[in-house]
């Protein structure tokens, strides 16, 4: 008769995470008398997969009835396949011996790769806020996935960002990978409302890409523009001075007045108005009697904005010549800032 | 759901034989080996042998070797172990075991005394 | 036949405290093969963990093992009070198949 031979028919199998795998495998005889084991891998370091009649094998189903007196399909299925089950598996008949059963022939292998998909994208920006003009850094990281093949990119508000550098790991062989990638941005004035995308690509996929985003206004900083200037007249010994703060970002302001040197006013930014691009705009304004002075007075607008160093912008007001006769910028619209008069 | 069931408490003399039966009932009771454990009072876990219903074929503890046999009744999906010439430190609770080592008779204690 | 050697003998723990169980096997164990065990009074053992580190059904996640060849260990990360037992490693690599003395957990 001829000798009992082990036939594993497939090569490779290919099996998606989280899917069952079928293993199969035929013997040609019943003879000699002895179990079936599956193992992964060869050698002293192999694992048991499967016994037929010893050990817990909660993931592992047969085929066929093992307990058949002909059977000779030897076939199982692992349930709920990972990344980590990829492999080399062996189905090897053993003939009874004492006191352990002997290995008589094993199969050529069947290869099971795990298609694995890649997590949701996670794009982080840096630990401080910078200002525009600046270069700021990126990161994209994505894991779990395999095979290692991969594709990432980065766009800005929908253009394609070129300046990135991206690794995949392991560099060997695994069985699951994971992939990093940092970006470098240039902020502008106007991206308070703009986006940064990471875009992942993998077979897993079909087509239809994981997204991570970042928004900008987590990350910009744009610092104001001061502009103090002089209002008409309300009264005969009174002169209306504003301090207009525009185009910052984010909200957090602190404007203090100073009147030669000396604190007259800290207030913070709240009624604030935003501009089509994110920023913001707002105004302060002091009620200034001149009757009071004997002196020419200089008024400091003092403005620190999201902890920053402070910035100012000064006027200096004539108190020799006659109030309506000050010159006079740009009227501006009383935005309900406290009225404060120097006396 | 899967059950094993063992025969009630024995007391014996010592060099009598003791034979516990252990039926299992929610699973194919060829699948897997049948084993048998023992627990002296107060003692570890002892391997005392194996059966496979299937085959019928045995192993044991060479401990146990002259002294031990197991056996099964397919038509009724029991299994048995028979141990003879019985001493006091034979003195245990007895478990059948499936080959899966999740499923646990519930013990049967052999009290061995003159 | 291959020995089991557990160590301690006894391990006296609070709850909430972190239990470490060695098991060392007297010739090299394949890690598919090696088993761990819970016993409480009056009771069969219960499987723990299979295969040296996988979780059997319904065992919390405090619960690990880890080892290869001859040096296994089962830990439990934080003892609740339940977990005050006697704990047994066991071999089915070859005949006869063992098992180790026994480890057992008490309340400090």
């Known amino acids: 008769e001829e000798e009992l031979q082990v036939i594993q028919p497939d090569k490779s199998v290919l099996v998606a995470a989280g899917e069952t795998a079928t293993l199969r495998c035929t013997a040609t005889s019943l003879i000699p008398v002895g179990p079936i084991q599956w193992f992964r891998g060869a050698g002293p370091g192999r694992e048991l997969i499967y016994n037929q009649k010893e050990g817990h094998f909660p993931r592992v189903t047969t085929v066929s009835d093992l307990t058949k007196r002909n059977n000779m399909d030897f076939s199982i299925r692992i349930g709920n396949i990972t990344p980590a089950d990829a492999g080399t598996y062996y189905c090897v008949k053993f003939r009874k011996g004492s006191p352990d059963d002997v290995e008589f022939k094993s199969g050529a292998g069947t290869e099971l790769s795990v298609r694995a998909k890649p997590s949701a994208p996670v794009v982080s920006g840096p630990a401080a806020r910078a200002t525009p003009q600046h270069t700021v850094s990126f990161t994209c990281e994505s894991h779990g996935f395999s095979p290692r093949d991969i594709t990432l990119k980065w766009f800005k508000n929908g253009n394609e960002l070129s300046d990135f550098q991206t690794n995949v790991d392991p560099v060997g062989e695994s069985v699951s990978y994971s992939i990093h990638s940092t970006a470098k941005v240039v902020l502008t004035r106007e991206d308070v409302h703009s986006q940064v995308i990471c875009e992942v690509a993998h077979v897993t996929l079909q087509g239809d890409p994981l997204r991570g985003t970042a928004n900008l206004s987590e990350t910009i900083r744009v610092p104001p523009t001061l502009e103090v200037t002089q209002q008409p007249v309300r009264a005969e010994n009174q002169v209306n001075v504003t301090c207009q703060v525009r185009k910052f970002y984010p909200q957090r302001l602190q404007l203090t007045w100073l009147e030669n040197g000396n604190v007259s006013r800290t207030e913070t930014a709240s009624t604030v108005t935003e501009n089509k691009d994110g920023t913001y705009n707002w105004m302060s304004w002091l009620l200034v009697n001149v009757s009071a002075h004997r002196d020419d007075v200089k008024l400091t607008c003092q403005v620190e904005h999201d902890g920053q160093p402070a910035v100012s912008k000064s006027h200096d007001l004539k108190v020799s010549a006659h109030p309506k006769e000050q010159g006079s910028n740009t009227a501006a619209e009383n935005t309900g800032s406290n009225e404060r008069n120097i006396y | 759901q899967v059950q094993l069931v063992q025969s009630g408490a024995e007391v014996k003399k010592p060099g009598a034989s003791v034979k516990v039966s252990c039926k299992a009932s929610g699973f194919n009771f060829e699948d897997t080996y049948m084993h048998w454990v023992r627990q002296a009072p107060g003692q570890g876990l002892e391997w005392m042998g194996r059966?496979?219903?299937?085959?019928?074929?045995?192993k044991y503890n060479p401990k146990f070797q002259d002294r031990v046999t197991i056996t099964v009744d397919t038509s009724t999906n029991t299994a048995y172990m028979e141990l003879s010439s019985l001493r006091s430190e034979d003195t245990a609770v007895y478990y059948c075991v499936r080959g899966n080592y999740v499923n646990w008779g519930q013990g049967t204690t052999v009290t061995v005394s003159s | 036949e291959i020995v089991l050697t557990q160590s301690p003998g006894t391990l006296s723990l609070s709850p909430g405290e972190r239990a470490t169980l060695s098991c060392r096997a007297s010739?090299?164990?394949?890690?598919?093969?090696l088993y761990w065990y819970q016993q409480k009074p009056g009771q069969a053992p219960r499987l723990l963990i299979y295969s040296t580190s996988n979780l059997a059904s319904g065992i919390p996640d405090r619960f690990s093992g880890s080892g290869s060849g001859t040096d296994f260990t089962l830990t439990i990360s934080r003892l609740e009070p339940e977990d005050f037992a006697v704990y047994y490693c066991?071999?089915?690599?070859?005949?006869?198949?063992?098992f180790g003395g026994g480890t057992k957990v008490e309340i400090k």
């Open positions: 010739s090299s164990v394949s890690s598919s093969y």
């Open positions: 066991h071999q089915w690599y070859s005949y006869p198949r063992t």
């Open positions: 059966i496979d219903p299937a085959e019928g074929d045995t």
